[in-house]
């Protein structure tokens, strides 16, 4: 909407608002050690941080949600930080016949916004 | 992923988990009274509720996020309830020449999931 403007500067201080962060995880963490061969250690980007009023609003719905959360905080939740896009990654799988490569399009976040 | 299964039954009790809810709002609430016409309150559907482990997971990323949140709750946030789809709605706008209709594709949520 032309009448509510999302903003990109974080009013809470550096690193506090919704952003992409790299998290290390092992195959054991994910419960994947029996069916994924590699990589043994995964670098996963995830969306973390808060979504203060109008920060990185995903769309009109998120702008409205932010506004109504300010008015009815018990009824309407604040927008939250979720992936806006993903980057494809390849995992090496064990299969009955040996090993295969499989691409996952929705495993690692590439960008974040407040929805 | 075939190895983490999203689930659809809420372990927290009825109405507690991520779902669609109708919220009433006035034009004044939204700051729209100068440019939108409406004889009555607006009805908006929004996604509210919690996202317990594997509930309505949006995709592989959300399944992983849920798992890592269990292991590193301070580092990785739990998935949160956001729109999975939107329903197009029409707003009546005031214009210099009178009134016109405009369709918004991203204003009202139609379905919800945990991302």
């Amino acid at each position: 909407s032309a009448h509510l403007h999302p903003r990109d500067s974080c009013p809470l201080g550096p690193g506090r608002c919704c952003h992409l962060e790299t998290v290390q995880a092992t195959l054991e963490d994910l419960g994947w050690s029996d069916w994924v061969l590699s990589p043994r250690q995964l670098q996963l980007s995830m969306c973390v941080g808060e979504c203060p009023h109008l920060y990185r609003s995903a769309n009109t719905h998120a702008l409205i949600k932010a506004r109504l959360h300010g008015l009815q905080p018990d009824r309407v939740p604040a927008p939250c930080c979720v992936p806006s896009s993903y980057t494809p990654v390849v995992l090496m799988h064990r299969t009955d016949s040996g090993v295969s490569l499989q691409t996952y399009d929705d495993l690692v976040a590439q960008g974040c916004h407040c929805a | 992923s075939a190895h983490l299964h999203p689930r659809d039954s809420c372990p927290l009790g009825p109405g507690r988990c991520c779902h669609l809810e109708t919220v009433q709002a006035t034009l004044e609430d939204l700051g729209w009274s100068d440019w939108v016409l409406s004889p009555r309150q607006l009805q908006l559907s929004m996604c509210v509720g919690e996202c317990p482990h594997l509930y309505r997971s949006a995709n592989t990323h959300a399944l992983i996020k849920a798992r890592l949140h269990g292991l590193q709750p301070d580092r990785v946030p739990a998935p949160c309830c956001v729109p999975s789809s939107y329903t197009p709605v029409v707003l009546m706008h005031r214009t210099d020449s009178g009134v016109s209709l405009q369709t918004y594709d991203d204003l009202v949520a139609q379905g919800c999931h945990c991302a």
Epitope: - | P39, R40, V89, V90
Partner: antibody
């Protein structure tokens, strides 16, 4: 493409009720507003009320308030209109009509119509 | 309640322009839609929001709206345009209101 298929013609006694159904196919049922519009023989169109499945709320024209009930069953993509305390003046063709959700107005811009259901009220 | 007034009938020769009016208090500040209904058939939306046509509606249908009158114009009227036409808007509480309808007769 979108189709609205209504239930068949009805003959009713004065004082009784009638329930007409409208089954939608094509498009997302919950994402639209469904209205009921009637047309007495040789007369014009008259809006009775409507429902928006996603909000679960119905609105009625003042004239029919208290006598008409409009409901929707999302699982079958079907809308219903029940009119009670029927009188001879209720003899008409009843149409269901679908349109976009118009925020604050809810109904109008009827871009798809059912084939109509003739309800005859006679003793 | 808000009232829309239409002439009961309008006649036009084939190929000529037909104008069907819809009068209402300050209707120029309302959104108006027009529906066509042929005998024994369901209505069809032909014009909405001043002069927008749904897909499949010929370009010869257009609309205008100012002051107290909205007008549906059919240029180069054809025999197939013979039908009843209804205007529609909303009252002050947001209820749908239809005009009484106009029967368009294409002469000849």
């Amino acid at each position: 493409q979108v189709q609205l298929v209504q239930s068949g013609a009805e003959v009713k006694k004065p004082g009784s009720s009638v329930k007409v159904s409208c089954k939608a196919s094509g498009g997302t049922f919950r994402s639209y507003a469904v209205s009921w519009v009637r047309q007495a023989p040789g007369q014009g169109l008259e809006w009775m009320g409507g429902i928006i499945p996603i909000f679960g709320t119905a609105n009625y024209a003042q004239k029919f308030q208290g006598r008409v009930t409009i409901t929707a069953d999302e699982s079958t993509s079907t809308a219903y209109m029940e009119l009670s305390s029927l009188r001879s003046e209720d003899t008409a063709v009843y149409y269901c009509a679908r349109g976009p959700i118009i925020m604050g107005y809810q109904f109008g811009l009827f871009d798809h119509w059912g084939q109509g259901t003739l309800v005859t009220v006679s003793s | 309640s808000y009232e829309l007034t239409q002439p009961p009938s309008v006649s036009v020769s084939p190929g000529q322009t037909a104008s069907i009016t819809c009068s209402g208090d300050n209707i120029g500040s309302h959104i108006v839609s027009w529906y066509q209904q042929k005998p024994g058939q369901s209505p069809v939306l032909v014009i909405y929001d001043k002069s927008n046509r749904p897909s499949g509606i010929p370009e010869r249908f257009s609309g205008s709206n100012s002051g107290n009158t909205a007008t549906l114009t059919i240029s180069g009227t054809q025999a197939m345009d013979e039908a009843d036409y209804y205007c529609q808007t909303w009252d002050s509480i947001g209820s749908v209101v239809f005009g009484g309808g106009t029967k368009l007769t294409v002469l000849g």
